[in-house]
C-alpha cells in the first residue's frame, strides 16, 4: 500500500544583501505564466551557485515568494515581478513560503511525525 504525501507549509522572512552579481536566483510565475495550477504566484526556479541567495542558504528552489520589501506579489505579470526584484534596492526583504514534502507511512501504520493516534 502506498503512503500518502502531505505537505508542511511554513513562512519565513529572509533578508538578503544584494551581491556583486545581484540576488542570485530565478523566478517563474505571474498572471501570464502560471507555474502552479490556479495560482499566479511567484516561485523560485533556480538558485545560482555562489550568488547572494545561495550564500545565505535559506531560500530554496520551489519556494513561493509572497512579498518583496513588504510589497505583495499577488496578481502581477511575470515581467512586472521581475522588475520589482531588480528595483528592490541593496537590502531586500523577502517573505517566503516553504513547502516541505512529508512522506507518511502506509495507511494503518502511524509514521514518524504523524500526530494522530
Amino acid at each position: 500500500m502506498n503512503g500518502r504525501v502531505d505537505y508542511l507549509v511554513t513562512e519565513e522572512e529572509i533578508n538578503l544583501t544584494r551581491g556583486p552579481s545581484g540576488l542570485g536566483f530565478n523566478i517563474v510565475g505571474g498572471t501570464d505564466q502560471q507555474y502552479v495550477s490556479n495560482d499566479s504566484g511567484i516561485y523560485v526556479s533556480r538558485i545560482k551557485e555562489n550568488g547572494a541567495a545561495a550564500l545565505d542558504g535559506r531560500l530554496q528552489e520551489g519556494d513561493k515568494i509572497l512579498s518583496v520589501n513588504g510589497q505583495d506579489l499577488k496578481n502581477l505579470l511575470h515581467q512586472d515581478a521581475v522588475d520589482l526584484f531588480r528595483n528592490a534596492g541593496y537590502a531586500v526583504s523577502l517573505r517566503v513560503q516553504h513547502r516541505l514534502q512529508v512522506q507518511n507511512g502506509p495507511i494503518g501504520h502511524r509514521g514518524e511525525g504523524d500526530p494522530s493516534g
Epitope: 545581484g22 540576488l23 536566483f25 530565478n26 523566478i27 505564466q33 545560482k48 521581475v82
Partner: nanobody, 127 residues
Framework: QVQLVESGGGLVQAGGSLRLSCAAS????????MGWFRQAPGKEREFVSA????????YYGDSVKGRFTISRDNAKNTVYLQMDSLKPEDTAVYYC?????????????????????WGQGTQVTVS
C-alpha cells in the same frame, strides 16, 4: 529539468541556409529562456542568439545579426535557429542552452552562466 537535443546541422555551401532545432523533453519548457551558442575548434564559446520564455524578446550576437533568426514553438517544446547567408566562419558546433525562469538580476543572455541546461551540440560546416 528539461533535456535538450539539437538537430539540423550539416555541411552547406557558403551563402546557403540551415535550420537548427532544439527539442526539449519535459512539461516545463515554456518557463525556459533559451539560447544558442557555438564553438569553433581552438576558439572560445560564442553567443549566437537567445529568446525569452514568451518569444517576445530576441537577442543576437553581432556576428550573426541580420542573418540568423531565433524562434520558438512552446506547443512543440522546440526552439529554432534559422541560419541564412552562411559564411565559412560560421563553421562550429552549435549548442542549445536553457535557463529555467527569469533571473531577478540584470539579464545578460550572452553569459553562459545564465543557463543551467545544455544540449550535446550539432556540427555546422560551411564550405
Amino acid at each position: 529539468q528539461v533535456q535538450l537535443v539539437e538537430s539540423g546541422g550539416g555541411l552547406v555551401q557558403a551563402g546557403g541556409s540551415l535550420r537548427l532545432s532544439c527539442a526539449a523533453s519535459g512539461r516545463t519548457f515554456r518557463y525556459y529562456s533559451m539560447g544558442w551558442f557555438r564553438q569553433a575548434p581552438g576558439k572560445e564559446r560564442e553567443f549566437v542568439s537567445a529568446i525569452s520564455w514568451s518569444g517576445d524578446s530576441t537577442y543576437y550576437g553581432d556576428s550573426v545579426k541580420g542573418r540568423f533568426t531565433i524562434s520558438r514553438d512552446n506547443a512543440k517544446n522546440t526552439v529554432y535557429l534559422q541560419m541564412d547567408s552562411l559564411k565559412p566562419e560560421d563553421t562550429a558546433v552549435y549548442y542549445c542552452a536553457g535557463a529555467f525562469g527569469s533571473t531577478v538580476d540584470n539579464y545578460d543572455p550572452s553569459d553562459p552562466r545564465e543557463y543551467d541546461t545544455w544540449g550535446q551540440g550539432t556540427q555546422v560546416t560551411v564550405s
